[in-house]
């Protein structure tokens, strides 16, 4: 807590300016207006204050809005919102896209504070759905921003939205996430043919199921192995070896790197070694020829 | 690559005047402040003052009040260091520095120094 | 102005050597220090900020500690890149000001 004291004689600040920054701590607390320091907040970041400063402007600031800043403050705090809590973020109701690329910009290149993490959903919430402007200026700020939220949070993702999204944005989603965000990028992107369609489609396959890969075997499309290394492994276990071959095109050749790595491994389990061979890629460990496969999983639904 | 590369050396006469530029490369100005820090033979460091390219605003350190001036040119991406009334006292290798605007007082990245030596 | 007093001005050290350098300030500057290196007819290097955390780049046998008056820089492992002269710098408050140097030289 600063101490009150009285200002100096001719130290009172009339304007934010540069002079600032040889005053000392208490200096500033006494000489410079709280009121003066809201209005003229878009000055602050132009000017070199340290760390010790920008405390005690913050403290100013505090004192003034004891229920959260204005949205006129937020939008112009700079670098001084790297001194803001969480808690504090909590008070505010951002509202403007504005406001919110401000801020992020302040952070730009570092991680995701805990900070940024609690304006971004303010903001969000505020709003009532991730919408597309919103995710354009996350994704843009953060590629990882759609794979940080729940698949209960991405079920608010209008499928318009999905248009925003780069492949490197879902580098890091996990399938339960593609789960909910496959169906709304394949209502999104439905009015494509069949090339363009793959294009735009291919990131979010992790959350395909099996009747989709069938249907995209038929058309071509030359799926590369490391798309297929990322598909549910119970969406590509009912795959016969022609739809997979059909799949994956030239990249068939693939299969045999990753025989052993799901789902690849646990797919060759269920198919016949004779209908293996016929790949000529010398992938092993199939049905034997004369077995019999009982599909129980059919048998159970029935029960 | 992320630069600061400053003029060539200077020899001036008591009472005259120098100025010292500093070019910025690989960074643009914009998010970050300057600094002129000065280094008398055999001496340690002392700051002179800190400019802000964007805007050319300034704040010098007391002794430096009067007798110097830091400028800007945005459109080659270079400060300038004016320094008047030149004494023996001011013979020194002359820095510019940069800091974040985030963190103003800490110079991550140095000029390579311009020497300038007061001698009647 | 706050004043920063570097200790020892000078040390002799041989390689592989643990070496530490105090620096003290005349006030309480928090965490708000920074360690730099300077080899002869070179620039600084910044080594050390906020008292404690590694600038990119440079050999984790750096280490820095201390809060509020005193700070310390730590080399584990002398190397022979080593030897240089070292500089604390205050950022707490304007004007910014540097300890008078420790010259690092071989034994």
């Known amino acids: 807590e600063v101490e009150k004291t009285a200002c100096p004689s001719g130290k009172k600040a009339r304007e934010i300016d540069e002079s600032l920054i040889f005053y000392k701590k208490w200096e500033l607390e006494a000489c410079v207006d709280a009121a003066l320091l809201a209005t003229q907040m878009d000055r602050v970041n132009a000017i070199p204050f340290t760390y010790e400063q920008l405390d005690v402007l913050k403290h100013k600031l505090d004192e003034l809005y004891p229920q959260g800043y204005p949205e006129s403050v937020i939008q112009h705090l700079g670098y001084l919102f790297l001194k803001m809590s969480p808690e504090d973020i909590r008070k505010w109701n951002v509202t403007s896209l504005e406001t919110l690329k401000a801020l992020l910009e302040v952070n730009k290149g570092h991680e995701m504070s805990p900070q940024v993490a609690t304006l971004i959903d303010r903001f969000v919430k505020g709003r009532g759905q991730l919408d597309k402007d919103t995710l354009d200026t996350l994704t843009a700020f953060y590629p990882g921003y759609l794979c940080s939220l729940s698949p209960e949070e991405l079920s608010s993702v209008p499928p318009s939205s999905i248009w925003a999204v780069r492949p490197q944005d879902l580098d890091t989603c996990d399938p339960r996430q593609l789960d909910v965000l496959y169906p709304k990028a394949r209502l999104a992107f439905q009015n494509m043919n069949g090339s363009e369609y793959f294009v735009k489609i291919q990131s979010f396959l992790g959350g395909a199921p099996t009747e989709d890969l069938k249907a995209l075997s038929q058309q071509n499309v030359s799926m590369d192995l490391a798309t297929f290394m990322k598909l549910r492994t119970d969406a590509v276990l009912p795959l016969t070896v022609a739809e997979v071959q059909k799949l994956l095109g030239p990249h068939v050749e693939g299969l045999k790197a990753e025989e052993r790595h799901r789902p690849v491994r646990d797919w060759i389990l269920r198919q016949r070694q004779d209908d293996l061979d016929t790949l000529g890629l010398g992938l092993q460990g199939g049905i034997p020829n004369g077995y019999l496969v009982l599909d129980l999983s059919m048998q159970e639904a029935l029960s | 690559q992320v630069q600061l590369v400053q003029s060539g050396a200077e020899v001036k006469k008591p009472g005259a005047s120098v100025k010292v530029s500093c070019k910025a490369s690989?960074?643009?100005?914009?998010?970050?402040?300057l600094h002129w820090v000065r280094q008398a033979p055999g001496q340690g460091l002392e700051w002179m003052g800190i400019?802000?390219?964007?805007?050319?605003?300034?704040s010098m350190a007391q002794k430096f009040q009067g007798r110097v001036s830091m400028t800007t040119d945005t459109s080659t991406g270079t400060v300038y260091l004016d320094l008047g009334r030149l004494g023996s006292d001011d013979t020194a290798v002359y820095y510019c520095?940069?800091?974040?605007?985030?963190?103003?007082?800490?110079?991550?990245?140095w000029g390579n120094g311009t020497t300038v030596t007061v001698s009647s | 102005d706050i004043r920063m007093t570097q200790s020892p001005s000078s040390l002799s050290a041989s390689v592989g050597d643990r070496v530490t350098v105090t620096c003290q300030a005349s006030?309480?500057?928090?965490?708000?220090l920074n360690w730099y290196q300077q080899k002869p007819g070179k620039a600084p290097q910044l080594l050390i900020y906020?008292?404690?955390d590694l600038e990119t780049g440079v050999p984790s046998r750096f280490s820095g500690r201390g809060s509020g008056r005193d700070f310390t820089l730590t080399i584990s492992s002398l190397q022979p890149e080593d030897f240089a002269t070292y500089y604390c710098?205050?950022?707490?408050?304007?004007?910014?000001?540097f300890g008078g140097g420790t010259k690092l030289e071989i034994k």
């Open positions: 710098q205050q950022l707490n408050s304007y004007p910014l000001t």
């Open positions: 520095a940069r800091a974040d605007n985030w963190n103003a007082g800490s110079m991550d990245v």
């Open positions: 690989g960074f643009t100005f914009i998010g970050y402040y």
């Open positions: 006030e309480d500057i928090n965490n708000s």
């Open positions: 400019i802000n390219p964007s805007g050319g605003r300034t």
């Open positions: 906020d008292a404690s």
